[in-house]
Interface confidence: low
């Protein structure tokens, strides 16, 4: 008799990543009968919401519903109607909203309230919108990449499913760079985590993990740029800021009120004799790097070792996956190859930053100027953060793997967040083997 196709017994989940610069919606799918198996959940769709991050809607909360419409409608199309009511929807807001909450809890609550009301209007099983902590952001990013890399699986495979996979079950560290914060998360080697706020304990698939994590608020690439500008304008002799982090010939006017709008620049705030200043690019990598290093206070450390600003950081251990803006920026700069050494990256950054702005605009005509203008800064910032902030060296650079997707799923905190909230990562190893004979039809 001819085999009849059985109806697909699958489940879906939706996570919205409400970042500081934009919001993205991710749709995940998995076989219903394999919920507790490792590596079965995969991303089927990413929808980038048009517009800025939700924290920018403080003065126009009534526009949030429209803002979310396109991507939520896309989710309605992708997910079969019969599955809508049982598909959970989660929204997690990150450092942009943490900053807004620092300024005003009332305003942050108002934004989240409207977001919740908007998302409740869809036929899905809405589970709430919340500001996740920096610690959660780091932890869920770590869970995501190790889940996708198959690190939680106790089964040894005769084949490699991902290019970064190593034979052992040693987990990858996670390096996440956003617009407003950056996270470092990894399992240290036989090292006590000296600061309790940086310690996480997980039991996943029958194995215990003692994980270090820290989220540096205000050290995402966008807020770091605001910090650098606020620091440098303090010593400018007039309303012209000659900036080595922008290409020669680049010019942009900045409002002082915009500069001091974020809590991240408060430590540099001063009364300036002008309301605006003009950035004039001079495109010098070394000077840019030096200016960025001044954002990291490494003179004070109450522990055996620190990253910066007195924050404990254990000795680096194992391989690291660097994702989100770490990947997007380095991919644009064509620096994601495993074969590119740290010295080579530095050399290429020197050349890139020194290129005249007019030349850059011609070479990358399809890229929005706002983004294009900041790649010199962002690339230099990534180097500064990894080398100075996290103590990577030319030798250990090869242990950093710039990752965009793993097995078709974006590296980032959203998958780990959903896995946790849907209880799909068991503490103990499931008793049944993932592929039993009953699987075959």
């Amino acid at each position: 008799t001819q085999n009849k196709a059985l109806p697909e017994n699958v489940k879906y989940g939706i996570v919205l990543d409400a970042g500081s610069s934009h919001t993205s919606l991710y749709i995940y799918k998995w076989p219903a009968e394999k919920e507790n198996d490792t590596g079965v959940v995969h991303q089927v769709e990413e929808c980038r919401v048009k517009g800025p991050g939700i924290s920018k809607f403080v003065q126009k909360v009534n526009e949030i519903g429209i803002y979310l419409t396109d991507c939520m409608e896309r989710a309605r199309e992708v997910i079969p109607r019969s599955q809508h009511q049982e598909t959970p929807v989660y929204l997690g807001a990150t450092a942009g909203m943490r900053l807004l909450r620092m300024e005003s809890e009332e305003l942050a609550d108002r934004v989240l309230d409207v977001v919740e009301r908007s998302l409740s209007n869809y036929p899905f099983d809405f589970q709430g919108a919340r500001i996740i902590t920096g610690q959660e952001e780091g932890a869920y990013g770590w869970i995501t990449i190790n889940y996708l890399l198959g690190k939680f699986s106790q089964k040894t495979r005769w084949f490699s499913i991902v290019p970064y996979e190593t034979n052992n079950q040693e987990t990858f560290g996670a390096l996440d760079l956003g617009g407003a914060s950056t996270q470092v998360t990894f399992v240290p080697q036989n090292q006590t985590i000296e600061s309790p706020d940086n310690a996480l304990q997980f039991r996943l698939y029958g194995k215990d993990y003692n994980v270090y994590t820290h989220s540096f608020l205000c050290y995402g690439k966008d807020q770091a740029l605001w910090q650098k500008l606020a620091k440098d304008i303090q010593v400018a002799s007039n309303e012209i800021l000659r900036d080595p982090c922008f290409h020669p010939g680049y010019k942009k006017v900045v409002n002082v009120s915009d500069l001091y709008k974020t809590p991240c620049t408060k430590r540099f705030e001063m009364t300036l004799p002008f309301q605006q200043f003009e950035i004039q690019g001079i495109g010098n990598y070394q000077q840019c790097h030096q200016s960025i290093l001044e954002l990291f206070n490494t003179s004070y450390c109450p522990y055996s070792q620190c990253a910066f600003n007195g924050i404990f950081l254990p000795p680096l251990q194992g391989d690291f996956g660097a994702f989100s803006a770490f990947y997007f920026v380095m991919k644009f700069l064509n620096l994601t190859s495993e074969k590119v050494s740290q010295e080579k990256v530095t050399e290429m950054m020197k050349k890139f930053c020194a290129q005249p702005w007019e030349e850059i605009k011609t070479s990358y005509a399809g890229v929005k100027e706002k983004y294009l203008s900041e790649y010199c800064f962002s690339g230099t910032y990534i180097l500064s953060l990894l080398l100075q902030g996290y103590h990577f060296t030319a030798d250990s650079w090869e242990h950093i793997h710039f990752i965009g997707k793993i097995q078709g799923s974006d590296a980032g905190w959203t998958l780990g967040y959903m896995l946790n909230l849907t209880n799909m990562i068991p503490a103990e190893q499931p008793l049944s083997t993932p592929l039993s004979h009953s699987t075959y039809v």
Epitope: M102, E105, R130, T133, D197, R267, N309, G310
Partner: antibody
Framework: SVEESGGRLVTPGTPLTLTCTVS????????MSWVRQAPGKGLEYIGI?????STYYANWAKGRFTISKTSTTVDLIITSPTTEDTATYFC??????????????WGPGTLVTVSS | AYDMTQTPASVEVAVGGTVTINCQAS??????LAWYQQKPGQRPKLLIY???TLASGVSSRFKGSGSGTQFTLTISGVECADAATYYC????????????FGGGTEVVVK
């Protein structure tokens, strides 16, 4: 480390400043809080000063207390003490650079007695 | 406004027994909950933060659980040294609150 000082016997209405002196802590990277405990009672949150210098107070404490800081100290001013303010006052450091989620380092406390 | 209600106010437990302390938030605080131990005449000591993460040096006999508005501290294999008052504390909001701490639970070890 964290240590409070300035607790003493005061008469009602006489402003009192308590000082929390820190060592090995960068106040530009840590939130600090003041918590009090009346004799035989529970812990009562007064307010915090975040790394940025912004202050937040419990509803009942607004106008009655003022928190400020220098690079190595965090002050709590009891603007017009009443007998109800008799308590041991603790200073505590927040866990994490910007976090106010929990308090992982506490001083031994300083006793304030308000009596006429 | 993020009021914390802790129960029971007092509990007696035998050495080797298990004690459970509950904490309820009047509004959703997600995972932003910590537990402290305080012995008479001493400063509070952080036991657990972010609901279930053990602070450095704290015995694994202490376990935190819960989410949203309902939280629990469980002490198993109770020892004499565990006699103390335990407080929960929400870290979700530091403004528009009357107290971030629960009223406390006195644990008496027999």
């Amino acid at each position: 480390s964290v240590e409070e000082s300035g607790g003493r016997l005061v008469t009602p209405g006489t402003p009192l400043t308590l000082t929390c002196t820190v060592s090995g802590i960068d106040l530009s990277n840590n939130a600090m809080s003041w918590v009090r405990q009346a004799p035989g009672k529970g812990l009562e949150y007064i307010g915090i000063i975040r790394s940025s210098g912004s202050t937040y107070y419990a509803n009942w404490a607004k106008g009655r207390f003022t928190i400020s800081k220098t690079s190595t100290t965090v002050d709590l001013i009891i603007t017009s003490p009443t007998t109800e303010d008799t308590a041991t006052y603790f200073c505590a450091r927040g866990g994490g650079s910007y976090s106010i989620v929990f308090w992982n380092l506490w001083g031994p406390g300083t006793l304030v007695t308000v009596s006429s | 406004a993020y009021d914390m209600t802790q129960t029971p106010a007092s509990v007696e437990v035998a050495v080797g027994g298990t004690v459970t302390i509950n904490c309820q938030a009047s509004e959703r605080i997600y995972s932003n909950l910590a537990w402290y131990q305080q012995k008479p005449g001493q400063r509070p000591k952080l036991l657990i933060y972010y609901t279930s993460t053990l602070a450095s040096g704290v015995s694994s006999r202490f376990k935190g659980s819960g989410s949203g508005t309902q939280f629990t501290l469980t002490i198993s294999g109770v020892e004499c040294a565990d006699a103390a008052t335990y407080y929960c504390q929400q870290g979700y909001s530091s403004s528009n609150v009357d107290n971030t701490f629960g009223g406390g639970t006195e644990v008496v070890v027999k």
